[in-house]
Structures are given as structure tokens and as C-alpha cells.
């Protein structure tokens, strides 16, 4: 099943203490999927989309950018034919960067 799309959504973090908002979207024919957000190979958060929606927005509290390292990816799972679980591939990576202080 196709990989989801992923993107940072406003307000964008300006420091490591700011919350991070990441939207993950499945293709149109997979509403109500279970979404996983990864960083550094491990799970950061799980969310299920409402049955009439194709995606979710992960809201990570301040400090989430500190560990584990690496870019964020998301993935979704659905129940396919005969109630068999299916998993998408990973999304493209999304990196979170912060403005360089001018002082």
C-alpha cells in the first residue's frame, strides 16, 4: 500500500523547547488508518485517523526534538481483505531545524 505524505505544519518551532506539529496523510482510499510517527527508528507517537479522514496531525510537546535523533518518518496501517493487517512503507523523511541565533 502506498507510503503516506508527511510535512511540518505551522506554527513552526523556533527553538528546541517549542512544540512540533507534523501532519501525516494516507492516500484517498485509506481513511481511518492507524498512524505511527517514528524518530531514530523508534516510535514517538501513535494516532488513529477518524473514519472519515485520511490523515492525522501529531503534536509533540516541547523538547521532543532532543531525542532520539534523526529525521521523522510516518507510516500507517490498515485492515485489508479478510481482516488482514497491512502496513504502508515509510514516508519520506522530515527534518526539524531551528533558526540560527543572530547574537
Amino acid at each position: 500500500i502506498p507510503a503516506p505524505s508527511i510535512r511540518l505544519v505551522p506554527p513552526y518551532p523556533s527553538s528546541q523547547e517549542d512544540p512540533i506539529h507534523i501532519a501525516c496523510m494516507a492516500p484517498g482510499n485509506f481513511p481511518g488508518a492507524n498512524f505511527t510517527l517514528y524518530r531514530g527508528g523508534q516510535v514517538v507517537q501513535l494516532l488513529q485517523a477518524p473514519t472519515d479522514q485520511r490523515g492525522v496531525t501529531f503534536n509533540l510537546s516541547g523538547g521532543s526534538s532532543k531525542a532520539p535523533g534523526g529525521p521523522f518518518h510516518c507510516q500507517y496501517g490498515v485492515l485489508g481483505e479478510l481482516n488482514q493487517s497491512q502496513l504502508s512503507d515509510l514516508s519520506e523523511p522530515v527534518n526539524v531545524s531551528f533558526p540560527v541565533p543572530t547574537w
Epitope: G41, Q42, L46, Q75, Q86, D89
Partner: antibody, heavy 117, light 116 residues
Framework: EVQLVESGGGVVQPGRSLRLSCAAS????????MHWVRQAPGKGPEWLGI????????VYADSVRGRLTISRDNSKNTLYLQMDSLRDEDTAVYYC??????????WGQGTMVTVSS | QAVLTQPASLSASPGASASLTCTLR?????????IYWYQQKPGSPPQYLLR?????????GSGVPSRFSGSKDASANAGILLISGLQSEDEADYYC?????????FGGGTQLTVLG
């Protein structure tokens, strides 16, 4: 240090059942998907299935769906593989592997299962 | 036809480079896949080396030397594992792997021999 230790292998007759265990340590077990992979003598690895962190989502390879059941107990840091209706072609070394995203990076040393009458 | 095809064997000299290929079946576009590579030595489980999709989406395994690198050959519809500065300890079986149709699929493996 990440450690995975499989157990429960041995010689079993065709048609019988076997349950393998994988004891995990050195990482936050509940934050990672886990896999079972097998390797028949002289052959390449064959992926059997993945169970996600919370245990509610399991995906199996077509070749074993219906005969194998993967489960986990996060309170015991343990992964399980229940194998039913065993066949000669199930003879292999069975590895558990730690999830890396939904792939896997670290493997255990494996446990040998021999199906023979 | 297998999903992933690897040459059964490859030989190279110490200090040289070895290019191991993993060809995807016709109709499966290598550009859309992350290709994972594992090394296996006799009597040991496979060890994760790296994954490669593009230069902006790649990941080196923990402790894996930089002389192991991934790339793709779009014209051949293949993933490539490049090992530079070959050493005797690189002699092993190498497997590629992709996530295809909601399952992990391995190639048949390449046995790399380091001559001398």
C-alpha cells in the same frame, strides 16, 4: 547493549506445534516493532512477520499466514512465535529481530527447529 | 521471476572495490524503494549494514564503516552496495531487502570472496 535470546527450538514431528520465545534486553522493548525471520540450511533469510509495539497490529508473510501466530508481552520484554501444523520445509534457524522503523537492525543468535518424523 | 535478484557470487582483491547489485523485477521501479543491506558470516545472524533510497534518504547502520555505501542504478533497475578498500573480514554473504506488497522480501544473496 541490545540483546535478543531465542529459545524453544528442537526436533518436532510433522503436524505438531511449537512455541518459540525471544527474550529482549538493553532497549525499551515496548517502543519497537519486532520480527521473526527464518533461514533454512544453506538458504537466504525469509521474513515471517512483524508485530507492532503495542501488539495490536501483526502482519504475516503469505507463506505462513494461518499457521504462525506472533505475539508479545511487553511487561516481560518477550516476543513469541506459535507454529502449528509444522512441515518438513519449516526446518530452519528461527531468529527474532528488533524493529528499526518497520525494518529490523539487530538479530538474535537464533534457535534451530528441525521438523522430522 | 524473483522480486529481487542478486548474483550468486563475486570475487575481488584486497584493497579493491566491490559492487554488489540487487536487481528488482521488471515492473517494480527501484526509484520508489528503500533498499536495505545485510552482511552474514558463517554461523552468525545477518548484520544490518545500511539502507538507501536516495542521497537525502539513507541511513548507515550503527558502527558500520563508511567504506560501505549504497546507491542505485536506475537504468538497470538495481540497488547497489559498494564496498571500497576491501578487507579479508568483508568475506561474507550479502543480502538485499525491500518492503514490497506489505512484506519484507530478501534477495537470494551474493557470496563475496576476498582473494588472496
Amino acid at each position: 547493549e541490545v540483546q535478543l535470546v531465542e529459545s524453544g527450538g528442537g526436533v518436532v514431528q510433522p503436524g505438531r506445534s511449537l512455541r518459540l520465545s525471544c527474550a529482549a534486553s538493553g532497549f525499551t522493548f515496548s517502543s519497537f516493532a519486532m520480527h521473526w525471520v527464518r533461514q533454512a540450511p544453506g538458504k537466504g533469510p525469509e521474513w515471517l512477520g512483524i508485530i507492532l509495539y503495542e501488539g495490536g497490529h501483526v502482519v504475516y508473510a503469505d507463506s505462513v499466514r494461518g499457521r504462525l501466530t506472533i505475539s508479545r508481552d511487553n511487561s516481560k520484554n518477550t516476543l513469541y512465535l506459535q507454529m502449528d501444523s509444522l512441515r518438513d520445509e519449516d526446518t530452519a534457524v528461527y531468529y527474532c529481530a528488533k524493529g528499526f522503523y518497520h525494518a529490523f537492525d539487530v538479530w538474535g543468535q537464533g534457535t534451530m527447529v528441525t521438523v522430522s518424523s | 521471476q524473483a522480486v529481487l535478484t542478486q548474483p550468486a557470487s563475486l570475487s575481488a582483491s584486497p584493497g579493491a572495490s566491490a559492487s554488489l547489485t540487487c536487481t528488482l523485477r521488471s515492473g517494480i521501479n527501484v526509484g520508489t524503494y528503500r533498499i536495505y543491506w545485510y552482511q552474514q558470516k558463517p554461523g552468525s545472524p545477518p548484520q544490518y549494514l545500511l539502507r538507501y533510497k536516495s542521497d537525502s534518504d539513507k541511513q548507515q547502520g550503527s558502527g558500520v564503516p563508511s567504506r560501505f555505501s549504497g546507491s542505485k542504478d536506475a537504468s538497470a533497475n538495481a540497488g547497489i552496495l559498494l564496498i571500497s578498500g576491501l578487507q579479508s573480514e568483508d568475506e561474507a554473504d550479502y543480502y538485499c531487502m525491500i518492503w514490497h506488497s506489505s512484506a519484507w522480501v530478501f534477495g537470494g544473496g551474493t557470496q563475496l570472496t576476498v582473494l588472496g
